[in-house]
């Protein structure tokens, strides 16, 4: 990491250090320690205090972003005396050089695109690099395929999401021969960034009085079961006057997804299409291909 760490400490130092790769804050163990505590304060004066590790001379921050700059602090009491030490973690580099407008989305169940824009004050030779760490911090994923704009990395395509977990830490570092480039980091939930495919295997079967629509839930990256889905059906009578309201029907997910509605013969030509969403977020997929049923002379 290019960020410089500055220590603010009394004469006898705890030698506090921070490893941004593991998000681990550690310090020199003191004999006869009676009390230890570590925390960080961000630029908005929010305080995050994680649990101490078993050895009590380190702590790991799980869900934090560092790009706005933070101050770490360690308090240790021993039977003899008390220690306090601050560690400033600034985002060094010229202001406005970090990647901006960062966003990612998962699509087709196993692909992900992330995009960003170059910082407004970044020099021409700036180059950005994306690293992703899952919440278990077991491994770091480096971007395998960069999307480029005039040679500068402005996006990333991943076709293997096996290293991700439900919440992931994204870091965009920058380099330049001219000046220091600030980094940008973000925590993203996979469930909030996934765009579902529309439902598959949509069929319509009609008898003399009713029509039954069936479909299969879309394959998703997230591990969702049938109750986690919400569906919307658009049943549309063909050749109606412009401005006529479509019938939008909400259906909760079930083991066998079906919707039965009254429609007696002779029936006019209709079309039906379906879209899907996570029931908690209602981030709708695109519509499935329209399926037609009925006849023109109905």
């Amino acid at each position: 990491e290019k960020s410089d760490l500055r220590t603010v400490a009394p004469a006898s130092s705890l030698n506090v250090r921070f490893d941004s790769r593991t998000m681990n804050l550690s310090w020199d163990c003191q004999e006869n320690t009676t009390f230890s505590k570590c925390f960080l304060t961000d630029k908005k004066n929010r305080v995050v205090e994680p649990r101490l590790s078993n050895n009590e001379c380190s702590c790991t921050f799980r869900e934090i972003c560092l790009h706005e700059g933070v101050t770490f602090e360690v308090h240790v009491n021993t039977s003899q005396r008390g220690f306090q030490q601050k560690l400033l973690y600034p985002n060094s580099g010229r202001e406005g050089t970090a990647a901006q407008n960062f966003s990612c989305f998962i699509y087709n169940a196993d692909l992900m695109n992330c995009t960003w824009a170059r910082g407004p004050t970044a020099p021409r030779d700036v180059q950005y690099f994306l690293y992703i760490r899952n919440s278990k911090r077991r491994r770091e994923i480096r971007c395998p395929y960069y999307i480029q704009d005039s040679g500068t990395h402005v996006g990333c395509h991943l076709d293997n999401l096996s290293g991700l977990t439900s919440r992931n830490y994204f870091l965009v570092n920058g380099t330049s021969r001219e000046i220091g480039i600030q980094f940008f980091d973000s925590l993203l939930d996979t469930k909030k960034i996934e765009r579902f495919n529309p439902p598959s295997n949509v069929t319509v079967r009609c008898n003399t009085t009713h029509c039954l629509v069936r479909w299969k839930q879309p394959r998703t990256y997230q591990k969702l079961s049938y109750l986690d889905f919400q569906y919307q059906l658009d049943v549309h009578r063909k050749n109606t006057q412009p401005g006529t309201e479509n019938l939008l029907i909400n259906v909760s997910g079930d083991l066998e997804n079906r919707y039965n509605f009254p429609s007696s013969e002779p029936r006019a030509k209709h079309s039906v299409k379906i879209r899907a969403a996570d029931v908690r977020i209602l981030n709708w997929s695109s519509w499935s291909e329209a399926i037609e049923f009925g006849s023109d002379d109905g």
Epitope: K223, S225, L227, D228, L255
Partner: antibody, heavy 120, light 111 residues
């Protein structure tokens, strides 16, 4: 209509093992997550384990670790629960259930249950 | 000892409204993980009544409703009927146990 059909009641001696089956009809087991829960009059419901898609493996409750094995035969859409080193307090109704939602784990539907009695 | 705490029994006259509480902790309901509610009639398997804290599966009447706040949840039954007489259980996920946890159950009696 999806149904879970469980094997019949069992009477076992302490120290023995029991294997309970759960046959899924109306749906493919490979598309589902099955969990096992037992119920006793004294302890109520106890979650025993089941398939965790996040880990892509079957996970077990800590208190049954080492004594319980859950397996699946997707070719015949059947899940199995084996509990070994049986004790009298393992006397319970054992249920299999489909995970309907991974958010908080909601179960629907459940099998009718298999009564397992441990008696010397 | 059940991880989630419920009253052992509640009762009400036909047509009345009854509520059942379910208290958990910061590692389950307050984590926050979703709460489900089940109805168990004597000698039968549990039936899912509520999932995602307040959603009803198809076939469950709207007389059953639920809510969640902080580390506790509650189930309400309005227009109490004779066939609502059953045991009701709350359930959630617990991160410290890495699995499902249940309440001890509440017996609903229709007077």
């Amino acid at each position: 209509q999806v149904q879970l059909v469980q094997s019949g009641a069992e009477v076992k001696k302490p120290g023995a093992s029991v294997k309970v089956s759960c046959k899924i009809s109306g749906h493919s087991l490979s598309e589902l997550s099955i969990h096992w829960v037992r119920q006793t009059p004294t302890k109520g419901f106890e979650w025993m384990g089941g398939f965790d898609p996040e880990e892509n493996e079957i996970v077990y409750a800590q208190r049954f670790q080492g004594r319980v094995t859950m397996t699946e035969d997707t070719s015949i859409d059947t899940a199995y629960l084996t509990l070994s080193s049986l004790r009298s307090d393992d006397t319970a109704v054992y249920y299999c259930a489909i995970v309907g939602s991974f958010s908080g784990l909601a179960y629907r539907p459940w099998g009718k249950g298999t009564m397992v009695t441990i008696s010397s | 000892q059940a991880v989630l705490t419920q009253p052992s029994s509640v009762s009400g006259a036909p047509g009345q409204r009854v509520t059942i509480s379910c208290t958990g902790s910061g590692s389950n309901i307050g984590a926050p993980y979703d709460v489900s509610w089940y109805q168990q009639l004597p000698g039968t398997a549990p039936k899912l009544l509520i999932y995602h804290n307040n959603k009803r599966p198809s076939g469950v009447p709207d007389r059953f409703s639920a809510s969640k706040s902080g580390t506790s949840a509650s189930l309400a039954i309005t227009g109490l009927q004779a066939d609502d007489e059953a045991d009701y259980y709350c359930q959630s996920y617990d991160s410290s146990l890495s699995g499902s946890v249940f309440g001890g159950g509440t017996k609903v009696t229709v007077l």
